[in-house]
């Protein structure tokens, strides 16, 4: 073509894959009439007619562009839709009159690659390898043109380094014309790289400018020999009996060696292997004082069969022994004195406290409780608490029952019980004393005795309410070798005037309790029995 050497550089049109390229014919009016133009695509220096414009009307030529071309801007612009990578070529428009002139357009196509996918070498890398080993592979799919890859370690770009770092990249062309880039990073790693963060970055261009995409960060398993093993105990701090204690072996090698935990036998001084769980952890639950002692860990490298021993670690499980109170079951006369002594052993300094069991009142701070001029009311429970102030929750207690010799003690002399005739009453009578009293009733009925504690007894009587019973009332008599005492239960007939709105006189079994510990008024509910003559 005459004068081709002097042709100006083609106009550059940049477009992303899938969008529409607007190819504007740049011929001036003097160079040609735009109402009569031919459009060509140039591929490998071969021109192919793809579109004709005649009297401002466009017509596609059969072929690959037939469906994607249209005329815009009053015939000056050819629109190419659904741009693909294969469309990256030169397009030219040629005016036919007054003389043949042409205008060239270079179409550049771009496509951002997908997010880079990074896969770490799952087998890991030994630190003593002779040449760079595969660390990770980075794949950038469906980009155009081929993106550039940069590898980073701990945020710093990696450069090729002989025998140390090698980056091996390759690409494949998909049927779509897009490129998939694969880059393999190979490196010689050191122990310190066990925590190193690697990632790859894809650099690519779009019509809007330069861009980049980063992969996620990965760490690669780095294998290095164990140099040291040690023991770790959880929880940290002071341990006490009852705690859940975990003793685990740790090593500075990867993979860790095979661990075993031993405890020194205090008698033989020999190390005896302990049984660990599946994770190699020795779990002491609940921890006991016998678990105290010297523990050590052995790490055996199954590849080299080299064995390493940890520094021994002393484990102290703090304890408070069973608390002993003497005398253990004191019996005293009224007016006498009593000294209660509390003893316990512990791995730490102990504090003692004496409390009254019934009230929780602190009576004494110290191991000895002295009680003088004992009254009957002084009988009952006293609790010694032995605790380790430096270890919250570490304490043991012992309850001692002080028995004061005396005749039975009734809480009341008399009580009124509301009843109806021909009802079965359930009456209760409770008495305390030392020795423990027995209870008898002055009427026939079904009586049962229940021991409440060493000095207290409860007797229950089921009795039918008769006119005679209403007249005499019911007496319960508690006796022991030191004397006897009586409580009287007066029975009063319920009638409409004595009923209060909240009275319950219709259901259940009548109950009346005479107890040293019950001060409330008795209530009475009852159930009707058949008339006496109808009972077999």
């Amino acid at each position: 073509v005459p004068g081709e050497a002097e042709q100006p550089a083609p106009e550059l049109v940049e477009v992303e894959v899938g969008s529409t390229a607007l190819l504007k014919c740049g011929l001036s009016q003097s160079q040609g009439n735009l109402s009569h133009v031919d459009w060509f695509s140039v591929h490998k220096e071969k021109r192919t007619l793809i579109f004709r414009v005649r009297q401002g009307q466009g017509q596609s030529e059969p072929g690959e562009y037939e469906q994607r071309l249209s005329l815009q801007d009053r015939g000056a612009t050819l629109a190419l839709t659904q741009v693909t990578p294969q469309d990256e070529r030169i397009f030219l428009c040629q005016g036919k009159r007054p003389r043949s002139q042409e205008y060239r357009i270079q179409l550049r196509v771009y496509k951002a690659p997908e997010e880079p996918n990074i896969q770490v070498n799952p087998l890991g890398i030994p630190v003593n390898s002779k040449e760079p080993e595969e660390v990770a592979t980075c794949v950038g799919r469906n980009g155009y043109p081929i993106p550039q890859v940069i590898w980073y370690k701990n945020g710093r770009p990696l450069k090729e380094e002989k025998n140390r770092v090698h980056i091996q990249s390759s690409q494949t062309v998909e049927s779509s014309g897009l490129y998939t880039l694969q880059s393999i990073l190979k490196a010689q790693l050191v122990k310190e790289d066990k925590d190193a963060q690697f990632y790859c970055e894809l650099n690519y261009r779009l019509p809007s400018g330069n861009h980049m995409k980063e992969s996620r960060e990965v760490t690669v398993p780095v294998f290095y020999p164990t140099e040291k093993v040690w023991l770790e105990v959880e929880p940290v701090g002071m341990l006490k009996e009852g705690d859940r204690v975990e003793i685990r072996c740790l090593a500075d090698g990867n993979p860790p060696p095979h661990f075993s935990i031993s405890k020194q036998n205090p008698s033989t001084r020999e190390a005896e292997e302990e049984t660990t769980n599946d994770n190699g952890v020795l779990v002491l639950e609940p921890a006991r004082k016998e678990h105290s002692g010297r523990y050590e860990c052995q790490g055996l490298d199954l590849d080299t069969m080299i064995s390493l021993l940890s520094e021994p670690q002393e484990l102290l499980v703090n304890y408070v022994s069973d608390v002993r109170v003497s005398p253990a079951a004191p019996e005293r006369q009224e007016g006498s004195s009593l000294t209660l002594t509390c003893e316990a052993e512990s791995s730490q300094d102990l504090e003692f406290q004496w409390l009254r069991e019934e009230t929780g009142q602190v009576l004494e701070r110290g191991p000895v409780l002295q009680l003088h001029d004992l009254k009957r009311e002084a009988g009952g429970g006293y609790r010694c608490v032995a605790s380790v102030p430096s270890i919250p929750g570490l304490n043991r207690t012992q309850l001692v029952n002080v028995a004061i010799f005396g005749p039975p003690w009734m809480a009341f002399k008399e009580r009124k019980v509301w009843v109806k005739e021909n009802m079965v009453l359930n009456l209760s009578c409770e008495a305390s004393g030392h020795p423990r009293p027995t209870i008898s009733w002055n009427v026939n009925g079904t009586a049962s005795e229940q021991d409440q504690d060493p000095q207290r007894v409860l007797s229950t009587l089921n009795v039918l309410v008769t006119p005679e019973l209403l007249e005499t009332g019911v007496e319960c008599t508690a006796s022991n070798d030191l004397g006897k005492n009586t409580s009287i239960l007066f029975l009063e007939l319920v009638n409409l005037t004595t009923l209060t709105p909240d009275s319950n006189t219709t259901t259940g079994l009548s109950t009346s309790t005479a107890s040293p510990h019950t001060r409330a008024n008795s209530t009475s509910t009852e159930r009707k029995l058949p008339e006496p003559e109808s009972r077999g």
């Epitope: 019996e331 070798d481 030191l482």
Partner: antibody
Framework: QVQLVESGGGVVQPGRSLRLSCATS????????IHWVKQAPGKGLEWIAR????????YYNEKFKGKFTLSVDKSKNTAYLQMNSLRAEDTAVYYC???????????WGAGTMVTVSS | DLQMTQSPSSLSASVGDRVTITCRAS??????????MHWYQQKPGKAPKLLIY???NLESGVPSRFSGSGSGTDFTLTISSLQPEDFATYYC?????????FGQGTKLEIK
Amino acid sequence: QVQLVESGGGVVQPGRSLRLSCATSGYIFTNYWIHWVKQAPGKGLEWIARIYPGTDITYYNEKFKGKFTLSVDKSKNTAYLQMNSLRAEDTAVYYCARSGGYWYFDVWGAGTMVTVSS
Amino acid sequence: DLQMTQSPSSLSASVGDRVTITCRASKSVSISGYSYMHWYQQKPGKAPKLLIYLASNLESGVPSRFSGSGSGTDFTLTISSLQPEDFATYYCQHSRELPYTFGQGTKLEIK
């Protein structure tokens, strides 16, 4: 220190009676119970009865009721076991023992041997 | 009556051995934390001697190698390390109700 000393044992003919004594010292006699326990030759221990010197209240093992009687002399701090209508099966060592209100025997006498034989 | 069954009736052991004697009551002898079971040692020609009272309390002056345990109906006397002076007959006794009864005894002999 607390001591209990039995006396009054010996050989006695069947059908006769015997009174055993238990002299106490070293504690307040009326504050504790006195029990009598029988041990036949080569056999185990058998509880007979108890007495509370403070009130003279007694309880007997049904097996010995009517045959044996307990009593005390507070002025002498001494307890007694009266044994009537003795038979060969009453041959045994008889112990007196002291207790509090939980009825365990913390102090025992050395025992006195009673042999019923014609 | 409440029956006491002691086992074994006799036992041979050596000095230093740990020995356990059990006593079973025909019904519970315990009341809210107190077990009315006691243990005695008797040597030939001597009176019984109180070792353990209320199931687990060591009588004053008794060596700590003796211990008692149990509640309800089943009780144990343990001698942690037999000494030559421990060869004797041992009795359990309940005081839960009248009449008080003793076990038939366990004779502990030198092996």
